[in-house]
């Protein structure tokens, strides 16, 4: 008689990434009997929650339940009912909530309590919501990409299973760009990590890793833009801000109260003789780049070398995966190819920023104007951050791989977070076992 497949013995996990600009829900799946193996967990679903980040609900917490409904119902559909009660759900909030907590711990707590109340009312094994630290965000992003790239596996392979695999066990560095913060994480080459705050020690699958990480709060792309506007309006002669980071012909009115709402602009705050000002785009990459550089204080460094703002950064080492907004922005600009040099990227950005706004709107008719208008700034910011902030060069640019997904799973901190909380990354290398025959009878 023919062999008959038994029902698959799988497990599921859910992680919600509550970012500054939006929330995404990720569903992961893995074979139950292989949970200590490397590379067996994969993403089966991503659901982007409609609306802003949870920190924006501070004055309307009663709307949080409805906000989360669609994606939680989607999770209910994707995961078999028999698995619901065993499926852990985690919510990690990042820099948007770190900023809200800086403004008011009480308001941040209220938002998290109501988020928890909403998520607790689903039939999953909800494990709570918390604001993760910048260090965790960096570390879990690094774990995610190296787990997916097979870097923790001790088996050497003669074939490559993923596009970026160099077939050695050298880990990739992780570059993460969000709306409110950015993280850089990598294993430096025989270099002492001079600042203890930036040092992480891991033992994963029987190997020790000394990892450098830093999260730059307020240097995500959205908060960096607010910083730049707050800095530039200080020296504007009137309520018109001629801005090189926006396309020629672009116009937008900004409320001064919105500009100073975030803690990220406090250092530039001043009493202005107007309540609103108008951004008028002039579309000049070089000037935009110069304006962005003024956000990075490179005049002070108490270590052998720094990134910016006096933060220690060891010499860059190895390949890097650049994901989240690094990827989304560069993908939109069609600049993610391995073959595109840094010089070519700069040239393309110069051309893109100089294009008139009306032309841009016509060319990208399907893209929301709010997002479309900011790609010139975001692309220029990415170049400035990587080159002047983190000290990549034209030569080392080729070591940056702009990554959206690896093996079907999104690059980002959520997978690493779940692997850690479900104890699926053992400190020691598991004993290799023969292939299981339990799948067929």
């Amino acid at each position: 008689t023919q062999n008959k497949a038994l029902p698959e013995n799988v497990k599921y996990g859910i992680v919600l990434d509550a970012g500054s600009s939006h929330t995404s829900l990720y569903i992961y799946k893995w074979p139950a009997e292989k949970e200590n193996d490397t590379g067996v967990v994969h993403q089966v679903e991503e659901c982007r929650v409609k609306g802003p980040g949870i920190s924006k609900f501070v004055q309307k917490v009663n709307e949080i339940g409805i906000y989360l409904t669609d994606c939680m119902e989607r999770a209910r559909e994707v995961i078999p009912r028999s698995q619901h009660q065993e499926t852990p759900v985690y919510l990690g909030a990042t820099a948007g909530m770190r900023l809200l907590r800086m403004e008011s711990e009480e308001l941040a707590d209220r938002v998290l309590d109501v988020v928890e109340r909403s998520l607790s009312n689903y039939p999953f094994d909800f494990q709570g919501a918390r604001i993760i630290t910048g260090q965790e965000e960096g570390a879990y992003g690094w774990i995610t990409i190296n787990y997916l790239l097979g870097k923790f596996s001790q088996k050497t392979r003669w074939f490559s299973i993923v596009p970026y695999e160099t077939n050695n066990q050298e880990t990739f560095g992780a570059l993460d760009l969000g709306g409110a913060s950015t993280q850089v994480t990598f294993v430096p080459q025989n270099q002492t990590i001079e600042s203890p705050d930036n040092a992480l020690q891991f033992r994963l699958y029987g190997k020790d890793y000394n990892v450098y990480t830093h999260s730059f709060l307020c240097y995500g792309k959205d908060q960096a833009l607010w910083q730049k506007l707050a800095k530039d309006i200080q020296v504007a002669s009137n309520e018109i801000l001629r801005d090189p980071c926006f396309h020629p012909g672009y116009k937008k009115v900004v409320n001064v109260s919105d500009l100073y709402k975030t803690p990220c602009t406090k250092r530039f705050e001043m009493t202005l003789p107007f309540q609103q000002f108008e951004i008028q785009g002039i579309g000049n990459y070089q000037q935009c780049h110069q304006s962005i550089l003024e956000l990075f204080n490179t005049s002070y460094c108490p270590y052998s070398q720094c990134a910016f703002n006096g933060i220690f950064l060891p010499p860059l080492q190895g390949d890097f995966g650049a994901f989240s907004a690094f990827y989304f922005v560069m993908k939109f600009l069609n600049l993610t190819s391995e073959k595109v040099s840094q010089e070519k990227v700069t040239e393309m950005m110069k051309k893109f920023c100089a294009q008139p706004w009306e032309e841009i709107k016509t060319s990208y008719a399907g893209v929301k104007e709010k997002y479309l208008s900011e790609y010139c700034f975001s692309g220029t910011y990415i170049l400035s951050l990587l080159l002047q902030g983190y000290h990549f060069t034209a030569d080392s640019w080729e070591h940056i791989h702009f990554i959206g997904k690896i093996q079907g799973s999104d690059a980002g901190w959520t997978l690493g977070y779940m692997l850690n909380l479900t104890n699926m990354i053992p400190a020691e290398q598991p004993l290799s076992t023969p292939l299981s025959h339990s799948t067929y009878v």
Partner: antibody, heavy 119, light 107 residues
Framework: QVQLLESGPELVKPSATLSITCTVS????????VHWIRQAPGKGLEWLGV???????DYNAAFMSRFTISKDNSKNQVYFKLRSVTAEDTAVYYC?????????????WGQGTMVTVSS | DIQMTQSHSTLSLSVGDRVTITCKAS??????VAWYQQKPGQPPKALIY???YRYSGVPSRFSGSGSGTDFTLTISSVQAEDVAVYYC?????????FGPGTKLEIK
């Protein structure tokens, strides 16, 4: 194991303030919310309010102006205060633990404390 | 406020009978319904959450179903120890509300 124990006066005079303490064990108030529910003699259950793990509260609007819920995590205690009581407030008062972190359904209930409002 | 109604205030059955206790919500509550059992002089005991998920330790003869506005608690084979009042509760929106209860008696 999980336990909740309500303690408070058995008799309260009209217009006075009713104070009840719920002492919990077997779980931490930093990890779970606690709800208050009451049951008038021979009647059904009526939800009063909740205190969530970080301390934020939600109340039944029908009683909102009259009561407050607070807690002391270190003492494992939740406090319930109902002002300006009338005979209508005569009931068994229960505290109950959220089944999940902050859920609105309850897996463990206290034994309840019977409160009579009478002069 | 969402009203929860239980059509039978009392049900009389024999040991071994199958019983269905119904609960109706005045508006859509999804599957955000819990069921409790209360024996005389005791606090309520949790049986079911999310309309159909049984708590561990609750006998398998208890099951829940329904979504939207109509919900049922079924006891597949009533035992003498099941004599109690059964309450449904919605937690779809505040204020949380309970049904008036259905008293289960043994003939």
């Amino acid at each position: 194991q999980v336990q909740l124990l309500e303690s408070g006066p058995e008799l309260v005079k009209p217009s006075a303030t009713l104070s009840i303490t719920c002492t919990v064990s077997g779980f931490s108030l930093t990890n779970y919310g606690v709800h208050w529910i009451r049951q008038a003699p021979g009647k059904g259950l009526e939800w009063l309010g909740v205190i969530l793990r970080r301390g934020s509260t939600d109340y039944n609007a029908a009683f909102m102006s009259r009561f407050t819920i607070s807690k002391d995590n270190s003492k494992n205690q939740v406090y319930f205060k109902l002002r300006s009581v009338t005979a209508e407030d005569t009931a068994v008062y229960y505290c109950a633990k959220t089944a999940v972190v902050a859920g609105d359904y309850f897996d463990y209930w206290g034994q309840g404390t019977m409160v009579t409002v009478s002069s | 406020d969402i009203q929860m109604t239980q059509s039978h205030s009392t049900l009389s059955l024999s040991v071994g009978d199958r019983v269905t206790i119904t609960c109706k919500a005045s508006q859509n509550v999804g599957t955000n319904v819990a069921w409790y059992q209360q024996k005389p002089g005791q606090p309520p005991k949790a049986l079911i959450y999310s309309a159909s998920y049984r708590y561990s330790g609750v006998p398998s003869r208890f099951s829940g179903s329904g979504s939207g506005t109509d919900f049922t608690l079924t006891i597949s084979s009533v035992q003498a120890e099941d004599v109690a009042v059964y309450y449904c509760q919605q937690y779809n929106s505040y204020p949380l509300t309970f049904g008036p209860g259905t008293k289960l008696e043994i003939k």
